[in-house]
């Protein structure tokens, strides 16, 4: 029973495995992986992938089988499959494997990237979308925008990213987001970079504005100098010979 | 979506063999194993056996073993239930039903409409 | 096998009162479904994995339990809902069904 010997495409059909309370989970958190047969079987098996020998054997007269990992630490996170058996099987022939399922056991998730959809300059009432990414699916991401303390919009979601649309008018400001596991216990990923929404006038009416000042001085500066020449031209007409300013 | 139908009501003589039909539409039908129920009138449901069509794997009911034999053709979505040596303790409604098997369901999530036999000389 | 002991057998009720039946397995089971049947028709799943409600169904129905012991409630009845409920296991083979429990208005 120790070697599963790979049975024929379809003969016997996969289960199902899944993890209580999630597939990711902080240190020390105690985790139960339910593997559940579509029929009734005899003995369980929980494999990761690449290994012949079974991590743990259940031997259960049920369509369930469960395994207990207790207080998982990171170095048992990875990818796990089951499998199940019937005796009038024959001896070693067990079911086709489960879908992977992976196991993440960390502190942190890792920080999203937080990108504006088209740009992050945005026309006069034209609608921006911020697309928050992450690595995982199935997670629940947060929207902020500096300068107000409660979270902007919240979305769950079956991607590993999630889109904020906001309103044209209302759209100009720094943004950052995060994502966490959607249910306890909690998994938080680090803030996202932050990023910048700006008018797509108001640049280039800060242009114009800088403009006219500019004129406007350089025409202070000429009208000066003007002063200066008729200035300066007249007093050499009334100056003595040999007499330069 | 989903749907069994079964094959229309039969009439046998004591000691004949009569084979119901159940054809499957909506979904892969190697999937999923397909059960039969029997159902005698005013009874409860009975569990006959169940076939796995990706494969033809087959589990019994002791108590029917040697009366029914549950086969399946993948070409035409068809799962069969052929009664032997009828007896008038035979005449019943006969149920087929989808297994769900998923990791979150694990019923009968969906049935034909029955195919009433009766065994009469 | 496993043997499942549905009671009441018959039992009758008013509309708008809360219904309870129970479902009694001669061993442990990972999970009880319940089927819905009326007269004529073939069986509806209605709950199951022990507390799922079947989509489309009414929010009134709700099951529970765990081991040997199940259980079937209507919060408050209602005429539609009359009709023969049976509990089913697929822990162990043969699979089995209860007995039914018949429920009529009153």
């Known amino acids: 029973d120790i070697t599963p010997s790979v049975p024929p495409a379809s003969y016997h059909p996969k289960p199902w495995l899944g993890a209580q309370p999630a597939t990711v989970v902080t240190p020390g958190v105690n985790v139960t992986l339910r593997c559940r047969a579509p029929q009734p079987a005899w003995r369980f098996g929980l494999f990761k992938p690449g290994e012949i020998a079974p991590l743990l054997f259940r031997d259960v007269s049920s369509e369930l089988a469960e395994f207990f990992l207790e207080e998982v630490t990171p170095a048992q996170g990875g990818s796990y499959r089951c499998c199940y058996r019937r005796p009038d099987w024959g001896p070693g022939v067990w079911s086709q494997p489960s879908d992977v399922l992976e196991l993440l056991v960390t502190e942190e998730l890792p920080r999203p990237s937080l990108v504006a959809l088209p740009g992050p300059v945005v026309g006069p009432g034209a609608n921006v979308s911020l697309r928050c990414a992450g690595r995982l699916r199935n997670m629940s991401f947060v929207l902020y925008r500096e300068g107000v303390a409660a979270p902007l919009q919240y979305r769950h979601s079956a991607q590993p990213w999630a889109d904020f649309t906001l309103l044209g008018a209302r759209a100009p400001g720094t943004y950052s987001c995060y994502y966490h596991t959607p249910s306890a216990p909690y998994v938080l990923s680090q803030r996202s970079e932050v990023l910048v929404i700006s008018w797509e006038d108001s640049g280039s009416s800060d242009y114009t504005r800088g403009n006219l000042v500019r004129l406007g001085l350089a025409g202070l500066v000429l009208i000066s100098l003007g002063a200066l020449v008729t200035f300066d031209w007249r007093s050499q007409n009334r100056a003595p010979a040999g007499i330069r300013p | 979506q989903v749907q069994l139908q079964q094959s229309g009501a039969e009439l046998a003589r004591p000691g004949a063999s009569v084979k119901l039909s159940c054809k499957a539409s909506?979904?892969?039908?190697?999937?999923?194993?397909i059960n039969w129920v029997k159902q005698r009138t005013g009874q409860g449901l009975e569990w006959i056996g169940e076939?796995?069509?990706?494969?033809?794997?087959?589990y019994y009911n002791e108590k029917f073993k040697g009366k029914a034999t549950l086969t399946a053709d993948k070409s035409s979505s068809t799962a069969y239930m052929q009664l032997s040596s009828l007896t008038s303790e035979d005449s019943a409604v006969y149920f087929c039903?989808?297994?769900?098997?998923?990791?979150?369901?694990?019923?009968?999530?969906?049935w034909g409409q029955g195919t009433p036999l009766t065994v009469s000389s | 096998q496993i043997l499942l002991t549905q009671s009441p057998a018959i039992m009758s009720a008013s509309p708008g009162e809360k219904v309870t039946m129970t479902c009694s397995a001669s061993?442990?089971?990972?999970?009880m479904h319940w089927y819905q049947q009326k007269p004529g028709s073939s069986p509806k799943p209605w709950i199951y994995?022990?507390?799922n409600l079947a989509s489309g169904f009414p929010a009134r129905f709700s099951g529970s339990g765990s081991g040997t012991s199940y259980s079937l409630i209507i919060s408050s009845m209602e005429a539609e809902d009359a009709a023969t409920y049976y509990c089913?296991?697929?822990?162990?083979?043969?699979?089995?069904f209860g007995g039914g429990t018949k429920l009529e208005i009153k």
């Open positions: 039903a989808r297994s769900a098997n998923r990791y979150d369901r694990g019923d009968f999530d969906y």
């Open positions: 061993s442990s089971v990972s999970y």
């Open positions: 994995d022990t507390s």
């Open positions: 089913h296991q697929r822990s162990s083979y043969p699979y089995t």
């Open positions: 909506g979904y892969t039908f190697t999937d999923n194993y």
């Open positions: 076939i796995y069509p990706g494969s033809g794997n087959t």
